[in-house]
């Protein structure tokens, strides 16, 4: 594998991670795929300091993060433990609201206009943030 030692062009370095901030929208799954194709993942927020950094860059705009409960419990896309980890939900959230009329509840988490988190319909075309860690060996799978 090869180690990434500096961030790609148009990405922002912060605390040994690289971040890319979209300027247009996609559904959560499509945003997730976008990040994966960049050998990255939707942003995983692990501290108040990282929360403030991301919030500063996205501004007051609904923005997807790498947190969802589409299979039951809330999970971070990189495997970071949700229960013991950092959380910044808005009051009364997450609420898995069904009243939006779009079918189903709300299974994907996003930053709201004040930076706090809300769960929403995963099909909504929000902006998103990709993150990849520096110094992490990128595994190249063996050729078949």
């Amino acid at each position: 594998g090869s180690e990434r030692t500096c961030c790609p062009v148009n990405w922002v370095e912060h605390e040994r991670s690289c971040y890319w901030f979209s300027r247009s929208g996609k559904a959560w799954a499509d945003a997730d795929n976008y990040c994966r194709l960049e050998d990255a993942h939707l942003v995983v927020v692990t501290s108040w300091e990282e929360q403030k950094f991301v919030q500063h860059h996205i501004g007051p705009v609904n923005t997807w993060m790498g947190l969802h409960d589409q299979n039951g419990p809330w999970k971070w896309v990189d495997g970071t433990d949700y229960e013991t980890g950092f959380k910044n939900w808005r009051p009364e959230q997450p609420d898995d609201w069904y009243g939006h009329g779009l079918g189903g509840g709300e299974d994907c988490a996003h930053f709201t206009d004040d930076g706090r988190w809300n769960d929403d319909v995963c099909q909504r075309p929000y902006r998103w943030v990709c993150e990849t860690e520096l110094d992490k060996a990128s595994q190249e799978p063996p050729l078949l």
């Epitope: 594998g1 247009s24 976008y34 194709l37 960049e38 050998d39 075309p125 990128s138 190249e140």
Partner: antibody
């Protein structure tokens, strides 16, 4: 100058296998997502598959899932498409294309013809 | 899968004409749209990405517009080298899909 050179096409019987290769030069291959796009004779373009720069993420169009495998060898600057259980409808010119996560194909190879026929 | 429908399927025009090709997505794709030009026996060439951003080296007589489900490629003054087939492509979600193509022919 970016160059993409496909090889490995040819005539194969239905149910057979073929491996296409695409030799890349003129850009940082390991940092670039790469795709295969095909075009049946006299028909339009169809995206087949894409792979991330490290090879860690792959995506396919529904009609080839489980039959085709995209891979890459970054030490050789080469992209591959392993095609199994080939069908007549897979007959096409297969293009290798430099891609990105946004999905635009900014550089293309000249294409290699795959003919599936008995 | 998102279906892309181009119209017309072919258009006959003369040098100097203004040509407009439309592309409609079966669901909203924001601005995740590209246009390609393909000449017989050649690989496609990226002309416009993100619905309206001109690829480097593409003449300014080409322009793109639209957002959501309806998009347009316009050639303001057709030149001899512009006779080709044009394809739109959506990259909003997998599988990435192309329109069926529009052939611009000499009248």
């Amino acid at each position: 100058e970016v160059q993409l050179l496909e090889s490995g096409g040819g005539l194969v019987q239905p149910g057979g296998s073929l491996r296409l290769s695409c030799a890349a030069s003129g850009f940082t291959f390991r940092s670039s997502a790469m795709s295969w796009v095909r075009q049946a004779p006299g028909k339009g373009l169809e995206w087949v598959s894409v792979i991330s720069g490290s090879g860690g993420s792959t995506f396919y169009t529904d009609s080839v899932k489980g039959r085709f495998t995209i891979s890459r060898d970054n030490s050789k600057n080469t992209l591959y498409l392993q095609m199994n259980s080939l069908r007549a409808e897979d007959t096409a010119v297969y293009y290798c294309a430099k891609s990105n996560s946004s999905g635009w194909f900014d550089y293309w190879g000249q294409g290699t013809l795959v003919t599936v026929s008995s | 899968a998102i279906q892309m429908t181009q119209s017309p399927s072919s258009v006959s025009a003369s040098v100097g004409d203004r040509v407009t090709i439309t592309c409609r997505a079966s669901q909203g794709i924001s601005n995740w749209l590209a246009w390609y030009q393909q000449k017989p026996g050649k690989a496609p060439n990226l002309m416009i990405h993100a619905a309206f951003s001109l690829q480097g080296g593409v003449p300014s007589r080409f322009s793109g517009s639209g957002s959501g489900t309806d998009f347009t490629l316009t050639i303001s003054s057709l030149q001899p080298e512009d006779f080709a087939t044009y394809y739109c492509q959506q990259t909003n979600s997998f599988p990435w899909t192309f329109g069926q193509g529009t052939k611009v022919e000499i009248k």
